[in-house]
């Protein structure tokens, strides 16, 4: 009679994470008598997966009834597969012995590969806001996928970006992998409504890539432009001066009026108007009693936007002449080292 052979017909098996893997194994003879055991890996460090004779293996079920005398099918199913289950599985026939069974013959092995979906990409931007015309870095991370092959793309408002670097780790063999990519994005004045998208394509996703997004509204700071103008006379001794604060983002803004360098009023932008591009406009006005001033008055509109150093614009109010419509004066004065008189 021909000697028993252990047949593992599948050289490799590919299973998606969470599914059940079937590892096939048949023997060509009933003799010698003895149990079958399944191992992952070979050599002294191999891991026992299933023992026909004894033990508790909750994730493993047999395909056929191993208690039947004439059974020669020793195939098993392993449930709820994870990337950690990847490896080469050996079906090994033992011969009954005393006191211990003796290994008789091993199958050629079946390599179990696990397909695991990448986690949802997480996109993060710079730690602080940046202004238009600057290039900032965004990172995208996704983890836990297998096999290693993966494609990552970056988009800004649907337009593909080319300036990025991507790494997949680890470099060598692993049960699962991670991807990390850094893209450089140029901010423009119109980016308040823009989005940066990281798109990950993998064999497990069946052509439906995963996307992570970042809103540039969380990254950009658009500094305001200031314009101070004098309005027509409201009453004989009163002049209305307005400070137009235009095209700023985010909304957080505090405005201070100074008369000859002395604080007259401070207010916080509340009832702003929103522009189509997502930036805001705001107007503040100051009623100046001209009769209270003997000399010309320097009115300064000082704005602190989003916690940045204050910027300001000044206007010289001529008291000596009869109050009339005046434009914004050129002379301006800083009142502190952290204040910038803009435009």
């Amino acid at each position: 009679e021909e000697e028993l052979q252990v047949i593992q017909p599948d050289k490799s098996v590919l299973v998606a994470a969470g599914e059940t893997a079937t590892l096939r194994c048949t023997a060509t003879s009933l003799i010698p008598v003895g149990p079958i055991q399944w191992f992952r890996g070979a050599g002294p460090g191999r891991e026992l997966i299933y023992n026909q004779k004894e033990g508790h293996f909750p994730r493993v079920t047999t395909v056929s009834d191993l208690t039947k005398r004439n059974n020669m099918d020793f195939s098993i199913r392993i449930g709820n597969i994870t990337p950690a289950d990847a490896g080469t599985y050996y079906c090994v026939k033992f011969r009954k012995g005393s006191p211990d069974d003796v290994e008789f013959k091993s199958g050629a092995g079946t390599e179990l590969s696990v397909r695991a979906k990448p986690s949802a990409p997480v996109v993060s931007g710079p730690a602080a806001r940046a202004t238009p015309q600057h290039t900032v870095s965004f990172t995208c991370e996704s983890h836990g996928f297998s096999p290693r092959d993966i494609t990552l793309k970056w988009f800004k408002n649907g337009n593909e970006l080319s300036d990025f670097q991507t790494n997949v780790d680890p470099v060598g063999e692993s049960v699962s992998y991670s991807i990390h990519s850094t893209a450089k994005v140029v901010l423009t004045r119109e980016d308040v409504h823009s989005q940066v998208i990281c798109e990950v394509a993998h064999v497990t996703l069946q052509g439906d890539p995963l996307r992570g997004t970042a809103n540039l509204s969380e990254t950009i700071r658009v500094p305001p432009t200031l314009e101070v103008t004098q309005q027509p006379v409201r009453a004989e001794n009163q002049v209305n001066v307005t400070c137009q604060v235009r095209k700023f983002y985010p909304q957080r803004l505090q405005l201070t009026w100074l008369e000859n360098g002395n604080v007259s009023r401070t207010e916080t932008a509340s009832t702003v108007t929103e522009n189509k591009d997502g930036t805001y406009n705001w107007m503040s006005w100051l009623l100046v009693n001209v009769s209270a001033h003997r000399d010309d008055v320097k009115l300064t509109c000082q704005v602190e936007h989003d916690g940045q150093p204050a910027v300001s614009k000044s206007h010289d109010l001529k008291v000596s002449a009869h109050p009339k419509e005046q434009g914004s004066n050129t002379a301006a004065e800083n009142t502190g080292s952290n204040e910038r008189n803009i435009y």
Epitope: P126, A130, T131, H134, T135, P223, Q308, T330, R340
Partner: antibody, heavy 119, light 107 residues
């Protein structure tokens, strides 16, 4: 008071790189941009780029085609400008200067660093 | 890139004279113009920004005006200490660009 202190003069061979530092003090480092401007002997001023220490955002003069790298170390309030693939025409005084983020007029300047490129 | 054409490239004037330097931008830069003074062997010094705003501590004899593409820098009464080279700079669109400079000398 506001100060920008730059590293000392450098002599480099063509093809080499130079890294100039600019240490800021007297103000909140992350609130202002640091710009780099160079001036060749007897020539005018040329803007190279800037970095915002808070966000790490940079703007570059494309004339330098990726030869300029600007980095910052917030722990030491220092900005670095590295210029690679040096050629003789890169011989110049390199200045760092401070500007309010988004407004770009440079109100405080470093003392300048002379970089000489010669074989 | 936006070109800043500065003129004249040099001028000679007497103490007390009114000195005017012009800068023309190749496209509209609104009012995003600064003027700097540079003395030999020294770093530039900001005098004017936002076309017309005077930097802290800068004497009032220095002034600026203009908008759009045409800008003017004026020294109302030239002083001996004003001998220097003056540069305009636009900061509307990157790369920020400077004019070629105007060397001011005293007769």
């Amino acid at each position: 008071q506001v100060q920008l202190v730059q590293s000392g003069a450098e002599v480099k061979k063509p093809g080499a790189s130079v890294k100039v530092s600019c240490k800021a003090s007297g103000y909140t480092f992350t609130d202002y941009e640091i710009h780099w401007v160079r001036q060749a002997p007897g020539q005018g001023l040329e803007w190279m780029g800037d970095i915002h220490p808070g966000s790490g955002g940079t703007a570059n003069n494309q004339k330098f085609k990726g030869r300029v790298t600007m980095t910052r170390d917030t722990s030491t309030s220092t900005v670095y400008m590295e210029l690679s693939s040096l050629r003789s025409e890169d011989t110049a005084v390199y200045y760092c200067a401070r500007a309010v983020s988004g407004y770009y007029a440079m109100d405080y300047w470093g003392q300048g660093t002379l970089v000489t490129v010669s074989s | 890139d936006i070109q800043m054409t500065q003129s004249p490239s040099s001028l000679s004037a007497s103490v007390g004279d009114r000195v005017t330097i012009t800068c023309k931008a190749s496209e509209d830069i609104y009012d995003r113009v600064a003027w700097y003074q540079q003395k030999p062997g020294k770093a530039p010094k900001l005098l004017i920004y936002g076309t017309a705003s005077l930097e802290t501590g800068v004497p009032s004899r220095f002034s600026g005006s203009g908008s759009g593409t045409d800008f003017t820098f004026t020294i109302s009464s030239l002083q001996p200490e004003d001998i220097a080279t003056y540069y305009c700079q636009q900061y509307w669109t990157t790369p920020w660009t400077f004019g070629g400079g105007t060397k001011v000398e005293i007769k």
